[in-house]
């Protein structure tokens, strides 16, 4: 079967109430079939490519475990399994200041060096 291209699927927006939790869905496809090398998953806020990171985790070669390296205020937790092309993120204890746009990103290293980031992101509305 032909190799898939890089793509990312995120909903335009997610709404939740302050104090509650929200899930920011993000799934992706990539052209590197059977890739099991080092992987980094990143979420950033504000703007793509340059906004501040709110979450980052890394998985070693051959591992499904994405070890959290950054979780802003300890409120961000990966629900999705990046090895299954899912970067869905849970945000706990929402505050009005969390009302912004979020962008997911995945990076491959090792034998393959490639990366991709959602351009439009998902808008989190906190009411």
């Amino acid at each position: 079967s032909p190799a898939q291209r890089w793509s990312m699927q995120v909903p335009p927006e997610v709404s939740a109430e302050a104090g509650d939790a929200a899930v920011l869905p993000c799934t992706f496809t990539h052209p590197h079939r059977h890739y099991d090398g080092p992987l980094t998953a990143i979420w950033r806020a504000g703007e793509p490519y340059a906004g501040p990171q709110v979450f980052r985790c890394a998985a070693a070669r051959g591992s499904e475990l994405c070890q959290t390296a950054l979780s802003l205020h300890g409120r961000f937790r990966l629900l999705g399994n990046p090895r299954r092309n899912d970067l869905s993120l849970r945000v706990e204890r929402l505050a009005l200041a969390d009302d912004r746009r979020y962008f997911c990103r995945v990076e491959f290293a090792g034998d393959v060096h490639d990366r991709y980031e959602s351009r439009h992101g998902v808008r989190l509305h906190v009411t």
Partner: antibody, heavy 121, light 107 residues
Framework: QVQLVQSGAEVKKPGASVKVSCKAS????????VSWVRQAPGQGLEWMGV????????GYNEKFKARATITADTSTSTAYMELSSLRSEDTAVYYC??????????????WGQGTLVTVSS | DIVMTQSPDSLAVSLGERATINCKAS??????VDWYQQKPGQPPKLLIY???NRYTGVPDRFSGSGSGTDFTLTISSLQAEDVAVYYC?????????FGQGTKVEIK
Amino acid sequence: QVQLVQSGAEVKKPGASVKVSCKASGYTFPRYDVSWVRQAPGQGLEWMGVIHPGSGGTGYNEKFKARATITADTSTSTAYMELSSLRSEDTAVYYCARRGLNKGYWFFDFWGQGTLVTVSS
Amino acid sequence: DIVMTQSPDSLAVSLGERATINCKASQNVGSNVDWYQQKPGQPPKLLIYESTNRYTGVPDRFSGSGSGTDFTLTISSLQAEDVAVYYCMQSNFFPFTFGQGTKVEIK
């Protein structure tokens, strides 16, 4: 051949801790994730958490995060799962399982024989 | 957490007949479902991974299908040694979660 051999049955009192071991052989231990899964008598399977022995990184089911500690000793190819503040509902068979992979697919391909932990006053 | 609901809870099938077990996920889990067989006093044993892939050494009477939220394990011609409890498990989201199990017996 790949083998996971677990420690023997334990009887513990409520409030105590238990530490179950899982000795791996037949493969390169640091390369593969090891998960812990438990099964209460007559019940289904419940994933507790995982360790990547090569990095020592761990991930937990939130349900067990406060009470479970998963570790690994690469020098002896052994994974451990310690569960604290035991209660009667923790009576179960505890399994370790290797997360094998093939062409980018992951699965539990080898399991320990199980360790029965009984919590009773 | 993702809830995996199997149906039926138990199933009695004549030798040589087809057995079908369903598993429904509470949300889309792609094709990331495995099936395990467990016999009394033994650990689970992998049958099917990634919804449709038969694991090494598993007889071809076992097959899996489905994606999204609905998955099926089929035993095309039940043998005596297939009496066991069967579990589906999703690995798309953490924590990994299992179905409650389906007990397969001989009618």
